[in-house]
């Protein structure tokens, strides 16, 4: 969880607090989903490994005009140490697999919950 230390905030935010905020936002998205999230937009699947925050942002940043994930995009940009722009791809993308944003969010949420538990009980 040490890679979460770069979370952008007015002051120092403990990594677990930042992670918890991101998870809460993803929970809100999944719970408040009525119509298909982001009109069923497709994004590149990613490997949920060490550099996944930047990879997740690189995938989601290509979705435009979807207010439901704007806060998530902003939060992920705080977790990623470098600037990410649309069309940028890292080796963490599974470039032959595209999934719906809703599934992407669900997969990311499950993995972040697991990371949060690991961080709590270390």
């Amino acid at each position: 969880l040490t890679c979460l230390g770069g979370f952008a905030s007015p002051g120092p935010v403990p990594p677990s607090t930042a992670l918890r905020e991101l998870i809460e936002e993803l929970v809100n998205i999944t719970q408040n989903q009525k119509a298909p999230l982001c009109n069923g937009s497709m994004v590149w699947s990613i490997n949920l490994t060490a550099g996944m925050y930047c990879a997740a942002l690189e995938s989601l940043i290509n979705v435009s005009g979807c207010s439901a994930i704007e806060k998530t995009q902003r939060m992920l940009s705080g977790f990623c140490p470098h600037k990410v722009s649309a069309g940028q791809f890292s080796s963490l993308h599974v470039r032959d697999t595209k999934i719906e944003v809703a599934q992407f969010v669900k997969d990311l949420l499950l993995h972040l919950k697991k990371l949060f538990r690991e961080g709590q009980f270390n």
Epitope: K113, K114, R117, E118, Q120, F121, N122
Partner: antibody, heavy 120, light 107 residues
Framework: EVQLVQSGAEVKKPGATVKISCKVS????????MHWVQQAPGKGLEWMGG????????ASNQKFKGRVTITADKSTDTAYMELSSLRSEDTAVYYC?????FGGGPFAYWGQGTLVTVSS | DIKMTQSPSSLSASVGDRVTITCKAS??????LSWFQQKPGKAPKTLIY???RLVDGVPSRFSGSGSGQDYTLTISSLDPEDFATYYC?????????FGGGTKVEIK
């Protein structure tokens, strides 16, 4: 339906060790943290400690001064709480509890409780 | 450790009364607070989590509110089955800590 079934009542002598089990069903065991709570007769609730069943990582209450050991067996979907160096003040009902931290809270579901009596 | 001060420790009320129980944390717990109901000889039952979110199946007469250090459980109209002991719990950080409990008795 989430269910937590605890082992039966125990009577122990001072200085002995007790090990209580909590068998779960109705969800994926490694998806939620598992906690243990003590309730002495006529008293309130006290958190003893918890475990992440996926990794085996634990956290515990310093009040129990290292006398508590919490484990989880993924192969049987069972959590265990062991309390050593028992004294009369440990006479209590012990509960296991679990849940999704972000959806219902980490104590959303409770076992039925296990009464441990410490008496010489 | 975070201390949870719950008040009152007991109260007497009649069916139909509005009942309020409070919990004050010794520091900000970021709304990571649950409320439980416990009846004699039974395991606690979760009513509220995250300070104000009602657990599925719990009657809507129960509600939770608050933020920072101060939290409240309200029973809008007491039902005969609501006579029990209520506990708050902070799960913002380890060690998780419970309030001392509030026994709601029949007047």
């Amino acid at each position: 339906e989430v269910q937590l079934v605890q082992s039966g009542a125990e009577v122990k002598k001072p200085g002995a060790t007790v090990k209580i089990s909590c068998k779960v069903s109705g969800y994926t065991f490694t998806d939620y943290e598992m906690h243990w709570v003590q309730q002495a007769p006529g008293k309130g609730l006290e958190w003893m400690g918890g475990i992440d069943p996926e990794t085996g990582g634990t956290a515990s209450n310093q009040k129990f001064k290292g006398r508590v050991t919490i484990t989880a067996d993924k192969s049987t979907d069972t959590a265990y709480m062991e309390l050593s160096s028992l004294r009369s003040e440990d006479t209590a009902v012990y509960y296991c509890a679990t849940g999704d931290y972000f959806g219902g809270g980490p104590f959303a579901y409770w076992g039925q409780g296990t009464l441990v009596t410490v008496s010489s | 450790d975070i201390k949870m001060t719950q008040s009152p420790s007991s109260l007497s009320a009649s069916v139909g009364d509005r009942v309020t129980i409070t919990c004050k944390a010794s520091q900000d717990i970021n709304s990571y607070l649950s409320w439980f109901q416990q009846k004699p000889g039974k395991a606690p039952k979760t009513l509220i989590y995250r300070a104000n979110r009602l657990v599925d199946g719990v009657p809507s007469r129960f509600s939770g509110s608050g933020s920072g250090q101060d939290y409240t459980l309200t029973i809008s109209s007491l039902d005969p089955e609501d006579f029990a002991t209520y506990y708050c719990l902070q799960y913002d950080e380890f060690p998780y800590t419970f309030g001392g409990g509030t026994k709601v008795e029949i007047k």
